[in-house]
Interface confidence: low
């Protein structure tokens, strides 16, 4: 029951729904990423904070990363339930005192997102949405530029290699 050499309990990272997702999809996805645990046997379930009901969720395969494992689970919540606190409950034999690890997902303020655009209060939400879209655009633009750079580098390298080969052949003759 005790791991002497290292802490191999699941290490959680949480991902909250984006404003864009909640605005466009009328729902939000909570994602719970669990890393660096051993052994691979792990149980994950989701509940609302003040309820014992287990909610329907999905999970990825348990993946080996070096000497430990990782897994992720996600819960899609309808817009009406986004204002409730949710819990990702993780059961693993190396949770340090053997008790279930409870990862709290804070409520999402959907009222800020769904306000009338004419309302001044919604300006921040719209700005945030715009910022998110801008960031996403910037991200893809960056990837595109990176891809172009790789292609240019490949072409130049190829040209240089051919030129070198040509020069060398010239010297030999």
């Amino acid at each position: 029951d005790k791991q002497l050499d290292a802490d191999v309990s699941p290490k959680p990272t949480i991902f909250l729904p984006s404003i864009a997702e909640t605005k466009l999809q009328k729902a939000g996805t909570y994602l719970c990423l669990l890393e660096k645990f051993f052994p691979d046997v792990i149980k994950i379930h989701w509940q609302e904070k003040k309820s014992n009901t287990i909610l329907g969720s999905q999970e990825g395969n348990t993946m080996k990363t070096n000497d430990t494992y990782m897994k992720f689970s996600w819960l899609t919540v309808p817009e009406k339930s986004l204002d409730k606190e949710h819990r990702c409950i993780v059961r693993h034999e190396n949770n340090k005192n053997g008790v279930d690890q409870e990862i709290i997902f804070p409520p999402i303020k959907t009222d800020v997102i769904t306000m009338d655009p004419k309302d001044n209060c919604s300006k921040d939400a719209n700005d945030t949405l715009l910022l998110q879209l801008t960031n996403t655009s910037a991200y893809y633009m960056y990837l595109l530029l990176l891809l172009k750079s790789v292609v240019y580098f490949a072409i130049i390298t190829c040209c240089l290699l051919r030129r070198t080969a040509f020069c060398c052949n010239g010297e030999k003759s």
């Epitope: 005790k2 014992n52 949770n95 340090k96 005192n97 053997g98 008790v99 279930d100 409870e102």
Partner: antibody, heavy 118, light 107 residues
Framework: QVQLQQSGPELVKPGASVKISCKIS????????MNWVKQRPGQGLEWIGR????????KYNGEFKAKATLTADKSARTAYMQLNNLTSVDSAVYFC????????????WGQGTLVTVS | DIQMTQSPASLSASVGETVTITCRAS??????LSWYQQKQGKSPQLLVY???TLAEGVPSRFSGSGYGTQFSLKINSLQPVDFGNYYC?????????FGGGTKLEIK
């Protein structure tokens, strides 16, 4: 406020068995480990074992494996500990206690049940 | 099993004094240590968990510190209600053993 209510004192004869109970006041009974702790008169605390009422999973301190049996009734929100083949060294106060947090200790304790073997 | 050694076994102090109780683990337990107070005939009460986090409702004159194998519980400005027995307990794996206890008495 969560409360753990334990059964009353027991006076038992050597060689007999006793079953003590611990009822919890809140709905999360199934989702928390219920622990049992022994305290002999004027002595320190010893962890006996724990049960996860949700699926009946149990873990025991090696020293108590042959002595204690932990069970739980989810519908009654009650945990039980049966002590077998009692001798004078089993005379003690037995506490139930609940682990509430991943990084914490025993947050809630029962008031204790005195078992006297005589 | 991990052994928890608590010292001193008993301690006399006056109201208003500051006292420190120490606890040593036989191996590295990181921060997985709790402190409890127990009054005569009562059940233990959680004071500190995860080495230095005060449990709900515990006065700020109590503080926990330490990491790995060496831990301490400090009580500033002792109050009459603080007298009783104190126990440390590790919860790094099983079994979660307790220290032998420290009896804090009024001088």
């Amino acid at each position: 406020q969560v409360q753990l209510q334990q059964s009353g004192p027991e006076l038992v004869k050597p060689g007999a068995s006793v079953k003590i109970s611990c009822k919890i006041s809140d709905y999360t009974f199934s989702n928390s480990w219920m622990n049992w702790v022994k305290q002999r008169p004027g002595q320190g605390l010893e962890w006996i074992g724990r049960i996860y009422p949700g699926d009946g999973d149990t873990k025991y301190n090696g020293e108590f494996k042959a002595k204690a049996t932990l069970t739980a009734d989810k519908s009654a929100r009650t945990a039980y500990m049966q002590l077998n083949n009692l001798t004078s060294v089993d005379s003690a106060v037995y506490f139930c206690a609940r682990w509430e947090r991943y990084d914490g200790g025993f947050t809630y304790w029962g008031q204790g049940t005195l078992v006297t073997v005589s | 099993d991990i052994q928890m050694t608590q010292s001193p076994a008993s301690l006399s102090a006056s109201v208003g004094e500051t006292v420190t109780i120490t606890c040593r683990a036989s191996e590295n337990i990181y921060s997985y240590l709790s402190w409890y107070q127990q009054k005569q005939g009562k059940s233990p009460q959680l004071l500190v968990y995860y080495a230095n986090t005060l449990a709900e409702g515990v006065p700020s004159r109590f503080s926990g510190s330490g990491y790995g194998t060496q831990f301490s519980l400090k009580i500033n400005s002792l109050q009459p209600v603080d007298f009783g027995n104190y126990y440390c307990q590790h919860h790094y794996g099983l079994p979660p053993t307790f220290g032998g206890g420290t009896k804090l008495e009024i001088k």
